[in-house]
Interface confidence: low
């Protein structure tokens, strides 16, 4: 069979950017593009994404957001450019190459989007005294994939007690995360929320510092 090569690791692409799904083959010395049949398709549904046959680019069948690298095809570069990446693009794409023989390989696209700096709210937010039970809410928006949320005190020690975290996908598939910490106030202290994107290994931090009265929130970065 024809050897078709793709990267082993998933291609990570930020939402809204362009991604290149690399695929290559080794053409014979006498190879001409007229002999080439190239098909990119979604691995799971077999939906056609892009194709090249009969010596010419047959175009995108995938929302007109794909392109080949025509000047590089003759050298065995069958890579696909996917423009304006969306969450819904995540998954496995298969590159089929047929000349005399044929071969195929699948490449995974992992989509990612950074989470916004968390906004922090505190309830109740006045007349607080040590020993009071308060609810601190950390909200971060439009990230992907689902976040990991961690709470810490001012010394960096984890706060794992009464935490409720919910994540909701919007119409674009991006997640809004809301994490609620219920905690008994100490004499003073800082409560930090860390929202981690597991793919980008990106951390977004928010914190609220309680120093008696009044409550102070750090300025937004």
């Amino acid at each position: 069979a024809l050897e078709v090569q793709v990267p082993e690791d998933p291609v990570v692409a930020l939402v809204g950017t362009d991604a290149t799904l690399r695929c290559s083959f080794s053409p014979e010395p006498d190879f001409s593009l007229a002999q080439l049949n190239l098909i990119w398709q979604l691995t799971d549904t077999k939906q056609l994404v892009h194709s090249f046959s009969e010596g010419r680019d047959q175009g995108s069948a995938y929302a007109n957001r794909t392109a080949l690298f025509p000047d590089l095809l003759a050298q065995g570069n069958a890579s696909l450019r996917l423009q304006r990446v969306r969450v819904a693009d995540e998954g496995s794409f298969t590159c089929f190459v047929s000349i005399r023989d044929f071969g195929s390989a699948a490449v995974s696209l992992q989509v990612a989007a950074p989470y916004s700096k968390p906004s922090m709210t505190l309830e109740p937010n006045k007349d607080l005294r040590p020993g009071d039970m308060v609810t601190i809410t950390c909200s971060s928006y439009r990230g992907y994939p689902e976040a990991e949320v961690f709470w810490q005190d001012g010394q960096g020690a984890p706060l794992t007690g009464n935490v409720t975290t919910s994540q909701m996908a919007n119409e674009q598939g991006l997640f809004d995360v809301r994490s609620v910490l219920r905690v008994v106030l100490g004499a003073n202290g800082t409560y930090s929320c860390l929202v981690r994107n597991p793919v980008l290994q990106q951390d977004a931090h928010g914190s609220v510092t309680i120093t008696g009265q009044p409550m102070t929130f750090p300025p937004e970065a």
Epitope: P10, L42, T43, D44, T45, K46, V87, A88, D89, E90, G91, S92, A106, S108, L109, P145, M168, A169, E171, G173
Partner: antibody
């Protein structure tokens, strides 16, 4: 909170049809593919097919083409599966399940299952 | 269709043990491997998706690993509430297919 509520147990005669329902709440019903999965007593799980309620697009595994028909009602956020020409091998628990992130075929929320018993 | 094989159909372990459940695919599934827990009452829950990503709300004692055709689910410090049947499922190619399940029991 995201929930899938399935209809109650069904007892049916061989050759008859049944229509199972799965009511979704807590999320945008039209944005997620809904799956149906079969489990025979003491057996593993078997994927039947999926429907995208936003436009009614469906996919079936070969074995269940002609046996199962998937539909969805956007107004009531309810997915349905009709099983026709019932036979004893259709006796099973049927689950509906929401597919998670687009393009990743995992099922993040499951209904409690509906038991279908086919008996004469 | 891709065949998923869980060679161990039942497994006995003691509370506090570390338990590993294996799953093999009939071909490379590019890490598109998910794990589910089915309790004796029939309730099914997603534990891990894409080989190692812990689903929201799942205790951190559950972890997943693997690549190519061989994957595993590990439960550290086994608890009574972990008594269930565990299924693997590939999501690389339609139709999605499940392993036969591994029933976990207490010694």
């Amino acid at each position: 909170q995201v929930q899938l509520q399935q209809s109650g147990a069904e007892l049916a005669r061989p050759g008859a049809s049944v229509k199972l329902s799965c009511k979704a709440s807590g999320y945008t019903f039209t944005s997620y593919w809904m799956q149906w999965v079969k489990q025979r007593p003491g057996q593993g799980l078997e994927w039947i097919g999926t429907i995208y309620p936003g436009d009614g697009d469906t996919r079936y595994t070969q074995k269940f083409k002609g046996k199962a028909t998937l539909t969805a009602d956007k107004s009531s956020s309810t997915a349905y599966m009709q099983l026709s020409s019932l036979a004893s091998e259709d006796s099973a628990v049927y689950y509906c399940a929401r597919r998670g992130i687009p393009r990743l075929w995992y099922f993040d929320v499951w209904g409690a299952g509906t038991t279908v018993t086919v008996s004469s | 269709d891709i065949q998923m094989t869980q060679t161990t159909s039942s497994l006995s372990a003691s509370l506090g043990d570390r338990v590993t459940i294996s799953c093999r695919a009939s071909q490379d599934i590019s890490n598109y491997l998910n794990w589910y827990q089915q309790k004796p009452d029939g309730t099914v829950k997603l534990l891990i998706y894409y080989t190692s990503r812990l689903h929201s709300g799942v205790p951190s004692r559950f972890s997943g690993s693997g690549s190519g055709t061989d994957y595993s689910l590990t439960i550290d410090n086994l608890e009574q509430e972990d008594i269930a049947t565990y299924f693997c499922q590939q999501g690389n190619t339609l139709p999605p297919t499940f392993g036969g399940g591994t029933k976990l029991e207490i010694k």
